[in-house]
């Protein structure tokens, strides 16, 4: 897994008049790590972990750039020249990672009302888009716009790539986010689904990285794919993940199902409650 | 006393089909999983297909994906094998075996086995 | 794929010795290893399941152990009735792969 920075701003027009508020979140190794949301940018870390990597400094220098990177699409947005009525939006995604090998990629792309429209290799500086005529036209429309305006812009479409590695490289130097493992907890839960059924449900919640198997067994053998529903593995929001697999069983035959779960090289199994208690929680070994 | 008696092996041609049976007792079959393992003369063991209770879960191995179909009938309390497409590599002894309760995919009894000899 | 290798492939033992047996397995397995044990014209019977649980009615003198990649079947005291050949499977996967075996045949 390569350690990645990635930035998404949104900003918002109605009517044809782009509003002065924007959006901007910050996603450190895919976690949410700081965010403006306010008509007056002020950067926030998301949760502890994200202020253990800045330190016990201000967020000064965080502000300033992210509130420069909304100014710069709110202009982007003022000159897409097809705005009809009603609300629309700008969104701009900039990833850069360093890989295991040192290597870098950057790349930055373009999405007007959620669609994308244009990509731009930051390494390469190479431009790709969409087949459709609408993506084809927004995107002239912008890259017309962003060569006019390069000396305005400058900062921000030209020094993207370093600066995003310039900015990774600076927080992973605070070492909170270097290759820690933090093991999950798991928690197995009951339901009453149907007659003679019931629905087992396995929780793995407060882990990192975010690679996890989780799975049920019946008599130590894996159930099909079909046979079980998985969440998403989703931040939850303190720096680590959490996600969920559920199946449904006869009643009587719960001791026959364990919930395994595998992760960073550390494995246990997790049986089903049984009778009136709805939950057992357990740490694993 | 658990048993697992095999049957419908013998001689066919190569691209030829046999259908084996398995008929269980002494245990309640329903509430098992079942396999079917296969062993060449002189060789290890080889599974072949997994079919757990209610049929809700079924594998294969590669070599016989999409050649063979396990089945069961709980009211029969037998296990089967559809074999069709067969290959001089199929020639075997075929065990079915059950899945222990609780174990960790353990094949806790086996039939006898029933020897399928592809050959032309 | 899970890989499954056996050593030795072979050995030769007197009654009374202690044999050991190992079972490698290309990527982690948990425990989820079973030992069987298989006379010739026999069908196979479990010695132990889950790495280390030794099946009911199964001598003492047999014994697992391991988890993750590697897993020891140890006979602490061979006997008449131990000469046979020996199989680990795992079930951590789909493919319930057996290792090749390992004959036991006296010295």
């Known amino acids: 897994e390569p350690h990645s920075l990635r930035y998404n701003l949104t900003v918002l027009s109605w009517d044809g008049s782009v509003q002065s508020g924007f959006l901007t979140e910050v996603h450190l190794d895919g976690q949410p790590f700081l965010r403006c949301d306010r008509q007056k940018c002020r950067a926030k870390p998301q949760g502890q972990w994200a202020e253990d990597v800045l330190g016990n400094k201000t967020w000064d220098r965080e502000t300033r750039d992210l509130t420069g990177n909304g100014k710069d699409l709110r202009m982007t947005l003022a000159h897409i020249k097809d705005q009809k009525e009603g609300l629309h939006s700008l969104q701009e995604i900039r990833v850069c990672e360093i890989h295991e090998d040192n290597s870098t990629r950057s790349s930055q792309h373009f999405y007007y009302d959620g669609e994308l429209f244009l990509s731009q290799n930051l390494e390469t500086k190479e431009w790709t888009m969409p087949q459709s005529s609408r993506a084809q036209t927004l995107a002239m429309n912008v890259r017309n716009f962003l060569k006019e305006d390069a000396m305005k812009t400058k900062t921000h479409y030209h020094a993207m790539h370093a600066d995003c590695l310039q900015e990774l490289r600076r927080y992973l130097k605070s070492g909170v986010v270097l290759r820690r493992t933090v093991p999950p907890m798991v928690n197995v839960t009951r339901s009453e689904a149907s007659e003679g059924n019931i629905t087992v449900t396995c929780r793995a919640s407060g882990f990192y990285p975010w690679n996890i198997t989780l799975s049920w067994r019946q008599d130590g053998v894996s159930l099909s794919h079909d046979t079980q529903q998985w969440g998403d593995v989703l931040p939850d929001g303190n720096g680590t993940y959490q996600t969920w697999v559920a199946t449904r069983i006869c009643q009587g035959e719960e001791q026959r199902f364990t919930c395994y779960m595998e992760h960073s090289g550390n494995h246990s199994t997790h049986p089903v409650p049984s009778g009136k208690v709805l939950v057992l929680q357990s740490h694993w070994q | 006393e658990v048993q697992l008696v095999e049957s419908g092996g013998g001689l066919v041609q190569p691209g030829g089909s046999l259908r084996l049976s398995c008929a269980a007792s002494g245990f309640t079959f329903s509430t098992y999983s079942m396999n079917w393992v296969r062993q060449a003369p002189g060789k290890g063991l080889e599974w072949v297909s997994y079919?757990?209770?209610?049929?809700?879960?079924?594998y294969y191995a590669d070599s016989v994906k999409g050649r063979f179909t396990i089945s069961r009938d709980d009211a029969r309390k037998s296990l089967y094998l559809q074999m069709n497409s067969l290959r001089d590599e199929d020639t075997a002894v075929y065990y079915c075996?059950?899945?222990?309760?609780?174990?960790?995919?353990?094949?806790?009894?086996w039939g006898q086995g029933t020897l399928v000899t592809v050959s032309s | 794929d899970i890989q499954m290798t056996q050593s030795p492939s072979s050995l030769s033992a007197s009654v009374g010795e202690r044999v050991t047996i190992t079972c490698r397995a290309s990527?982690?397995?948990?425990?989820?290893l079973n030992w069987y044990q298989q006379k010739p014209g026999k069908d196979p019977k479990v010695l132990i399941f889950a790495a280390s649980s030794l099946q009911s009615g199964v001598p003492s003198r047999f014994s697992g152990s391991g988890s993750g990649t590697d897993f020891t079947l140890t006979i602490s005291s061979l006997q008449p009735e131990d000469f046979a050949t020996y199989y680990c499977?795992?079930?951590?996967?789909?493919?319930?792969?057996f290792g090749p075996g390992t004959k036991v045949d006296i010295k």
């Open positions: 990527q982690s397995i948990s425990y989820y």
């Open positions: 075996a059950r899945v222990m309760v609780r174990g960790s995919g353990t094949f806790d009894y």
């Open positions: 079919i757990s209770t209610r049929s809700s879960t079924i």
């Open positions: 499977q795992e079930s951590h996967s789909i493919r319930f792969t």
